[in-house]
C-alpha cells in the first residue's frame, strides 16, 4: 500500500527557518504535490506549494523555495514571519497525486520539543482519497 | 450575504502605528484567506500579504514585512493589519479581500476600504 | 517577483462600442490571472479569474483570454456602468502583482 512520509525541521542555524521534507513510498508516477498548511479535519488547510514534474512550481509566502529532492520527494522551506506564523505549533500536509494509484496526503508537524536541527520523526498517516 | 465590513478612516501621525479591522460575515470565516492590498491615490494595486485564519499563519510581500503585521481573532471573525512607523508614504486606502484556500479563483469578495492618512 | 504590465493606460470609448484591453507577464503564469474593475471611490471587484472564467454575476459581454504571458479583457457593447478602471492580477504564486490599470473613460 502506498504511504506519504512527512518531516518537519527546524534550521539549526536559522531558528525562524522551517523546512518540510515529504516522500511518496509506493509504485506509479509522481504527477502533482501539493504543500499546505494544515486545516480543519486533519487534512490540507491552504496551499503554500504546488510541485509539478514538468510544468514546474506555485508557492505562496511564508514558503521560500519548493524544489523535488528525488523523484518522490520534496522539501519545502518556510521563513517564520513571527508571532502570527506560529510554526511550532503547525501542522503542514503534503498530497501526492499519482498515477495509477490516485491521491495520498498526510500531515505531520514540529515535535514540541524539538531541538534546532532535529526533525520529527516520520508520520505516514495516509489519508485515503479517491480523487 | 458575504460582506467584509472595515473600520473607518484614520488620520495618523507620521512615525505612529495603526490597526485597522476586516469582519467577515456570511460565510466561514476558516474556510477562505485574507488578503490586504494598498492602493496609494490615483495609483494601482500593491498586494502587502494574507492571514489563513485557521491557524494564524501570515505571508508577507517582502516589501512590506517591516511594516505591516496581521493577526485574526477566528472568534469575532475578525482580521486585522498593525502598520507601524508610519511616514507619508504610507497614506493610503487598504483593502481586506478573501481568497478560497485553493487560490484558484481570485479575491472575490472585498471590503470597502480603509482610508489611512499620515500627517502631522 | 512577476511584474505585470497593462496597456493601454487609459481608454475613451463611447457606449455600444467594443474595447480590449491587454496585460503582459514577465514570465509564464500559465492561465493564473484575474481582472478586477473598480469604479472611482469604490472598492475593486472580480471579473475573471483563471484568465477566462467569468465570476458569478459577471455579465457575458465580459470576455477574458490568453495564456503564458499574454492576456486580454475584451467588453463587448459598451454599456455606461463599464466604465471604470481595469486591473490584471496574477495568480500563480505570491507576491502576487497586479497591473498598472487601465482607465476606461466615456469619450
Known amino acids: 500500500t502506498p504511504e506519504v512520509w512527512v518531516q518537519v525541521q527546524m534550521e539549526a542555524t536559522e531558528l525562524s527557518s522551517f523546512t518540510v521534507h515529504c516522500g511518496f513510498l509506493g509504485p506509479g508516477s509522481i504527477s502533482l504535490v501539493t504543500v499546505s498548511w494544515g486545516g480543519p479535519d486533519g487534512a490540507g488547510g491552504t496551499k503554500l506549494a504546488v510541485l509539478h514534474p514538468e510544468l514546474g512550481t506555485r508557492q505562496w509566502a511564508p514558503a521560500r523555495q519548493a524544489r523535488w529532492e528525488t523523484q518522490s520527494s520534496i522539501s519545502l522551506a518556510l521563513e517564520d514571519s513571527g508571532a502570527s506564523s506560529p510554526f511550532a505549533n503547525t501542522t503542514f500536509c503534503c498530497k501526492f497525486a499519482s498515477f495509477p494509484e490516485g491521491s495520498w496526503e498526510s500531515c505531520g508537524s514540529l515535535p514540541p520539543s524539538s531541538d534546532p536541527g532535529l526533525s520529527a520523526p516520520p508520520t505516514p498517516v495516509p489519508i485515503l482519497r479517491a480523487d | 450575504e458575504v460582506q467584509l465590513q472595515q473600520s473607518g478612516p484614520e488620520p495618523v501621525k507620521p512615525g505612529a502605528s495603526v490597526k485597522i479591522s476586516c469582519k467577515a460575515s456570511g460565510y466561514t470565516f476558516t474556510d477562505y484567506n485574507i488578503h490586504w492590498v494598498r492602493q496609494s491615490h490615483g495609483k494601482s494595486l500593491e498586494w502587502i500579504g494574507y492571514i489563513y485564519p485557521y491557524n494564524g499563519g501570515a505571508g508577507y510581500n517582502q516589501k512590506f514585512k517591516s511594516k505591516a503585521t496581521l493577526t485574526v481573532d477566528s472568534s469575532s471573525s475578525t482580521a486585522y493589519m498593525e502598520l507601524r512607523s508610519l511616514t507619508s508614504e504610507d497614506s493610503a486606502v487598504y483593502y481586506c479581500?478573501?481568497?478560497?484556500?485553493?487560490?484558484?479563483?481570485?479575491?472575490?469578495?472585498w471590503g470597502q476600504g480603509t482610508s489611512v492618512t499620515v500627517s502631522s | 517577483d512577476i511584474q505585470m504590465t497593462q496597456s493601454p493606460a487609459s481608454l475613451s470609448a463611447s457606449v455600444g462600442e467594443t474595447v480590449t484591453i491587454t496585460c503582459r507577464a514577465s514570465?509564464?503564469?500559465?492561465?493564473?490571472l484575474a481582472w478586477y474593475q473598480q469604479k472611482q471611490g469604490k472598492s475593486p471587484q472580480l471579473l475573471v479569474y483563471n484568465a477566462k472564467t467569468l465570476a458569478e454575476g459577471v455579465p457575458s459581454r465580459f470576455s477574458g483570454s490568453g495564456s503564458g504571458t499574454q492576456f486580454s479583457l475584451k467588453i463587448n457593447s459598451l454599456q455606461p456602468e463599464d466604465f471604470g478602471s481595469y486591473y490584471c492580477?496574477?495568480?500563480?504564486?505570491?507576491?502576487?502583482?497586479f497591473g498598472g490599470g487601465t482607465k476606461l473613460e466615456t469619450k
Open positions: 514570465e509564464n503564469i500559465y492561465s493564473y
Open positions: 492580477q496574477h495568480h500563480y504564486g505570491t507576491p502576487y502583482t
Open positions: 479581500a478573501r481568497e478560497e484556500l485553493r487560490r484558484d479563483y481570485g479575491m472575490d469578495y
